[in-house]
């Protein structure tokens, strides 16, 4: 239900940190964690209102 894999670069890291599928980058601890541990948007059924308009994920997100 959580948003899928993302690739992010840690604040002090020289290169992007790629998270494996089902993991997401935690900006506060600066490493990949299970996406379910972060309050990322849950997809809703078609027609249901979304809590926030989400743009398509950029590659680094």
């Amino acid at each position: 239900m959580r948003r899928g894999p993302r690739s992010l670069r840690g604040r002090d890291a020289p290169a992007p940190t790629a998270c494996v599928p089902a993991e997401c980058f935690d900006l506060l601890v600066r490493h990949c964690v299970a996406c379910g541990l972060l309050r990322t948007p849950r997809p809703k059924p078609a027609g249901a209102s979304s809590p926030a308009p989400r743009t398509a994920l950029q590659p680094q997100e």
Epitope: D12, C24, D26, L28, L37, L38, E61
Partner: antibody
Framework: DVQLQESGPSLVKPSQTLSLTCSVT????????WNWIRKFPGNKLEYMGY???????YYNPSLKSRISITRDTSKNQFYLQLLSVTTEDTATYYC????????????WGAGTLVTVSS | DIVMTQTPLSLPVSLGDQASISCRSS???????????LHWYLQKPGQSPKLLIY???NRFSGVPDRFSGSGSGTDFTLKISRVEAEDLGVYFC??????????FGSGTKLEIK
């Protein structure tokens, strides 16, 4: 919908401990970061700290060793304790949830005004 | 900590006018992942802060299109194209790039002239 509600005493005496509870409904505090933020008279907002999905905490260094944030996952509540308060701790205290994609505070409690006075 | 400097502190406007609020950060808010985590909140009288704009220029759900955010690096602006009575309150910018701690601007009070 996720809802947060602060509760606790509205009046605390100087040198005593300020204790607040944030009750969360509609989401589990075992996911995400749960935060305390306060607003002083005059509109200044200060970030106080968080407790994370794992139970780890961060405290703003400006609060030195006076602050403690804990949680009770069985009640889906998290707590703020601020020791040795002074009149300068008079503020409206908010608990807030953090969006884990864009890292903004997406849900806030209504806030509770705490006055420190003898 | 990142210092967020907001100007003006008070902004008297007439209904229908345009309003502009500036926010400057003490360091660039471009994260090494390429994103800029600069957000704007509005706190109406008697309410808690509510998100208006996230990541510089993205309107949150339900926010009217008269609100727009722009900027990059250290300089950011919130514009309200036609101020309505319901827009009155205190506006805060906030950064989530160099965290923790999250930091906020000093607030801009939008009021009727």
């Amino acid at each position: 919908d996720v809802q947060l509600q602060e509760s606790g005493p509205s009046l605390v005496k100087p040198s005593q401990t300020l204790s607040l509870t944030c009750s969360v409904t509609g989401d589990s505090i075992t996911s995400g970061y749960w935060n305390w933020i306060r607003k002083f008279p005059g509109n200044k907002l200060e970030y106080m700290g968080y407790i994370s999905y794992s139970g780890s905490t961060y405290y703003n260094p400006s609060l030195k060793s006076r602050i403690s944030i804990t949680r009770d996952t069985s009640k889906n509540q998290f707590y703020l304790q601020l020791l040795s308060v002074t009149t300068e701790d008079t503020a409206t205290y908010y608990c807030a949830g953090l969006d884990g994609l864009y890292w903004y505070f997406d849900v806030w409690g209504a806030g509770t005004l705490v006055t420190v006075s003898s | 900590d990142i210092v967020m400097t907001q100007t003006p502190l008070s902004l008297p406007v007439s209904l229908g006018d345009q309003a502009s609020i500036s926010c400057r950060s003490s360091q660039s808010l471009v994260h090494s992942n390429g994103n800029t985590y600069l957000h704007w909140y509005l706190q109406k009288p008697g309410q808690s802060p509510k998100l208006l704009i996230y990541k510089v220029s993205n309107r949150f759900s339900g926010v009217p299109d008269r609100f727009s955010g722009s900027g990059s690096g250290t300089d950011f602006t919130l514009k309200i194209s036609r101020v309505e009575a319901e827009d009155l309150g205190v506006y805060f910018c906030s950064q989530s790039t160099h965290v923790p701690p999250f930091t906020f601007g000093s607030g801009t009070k939008l009021e009727i002239k």
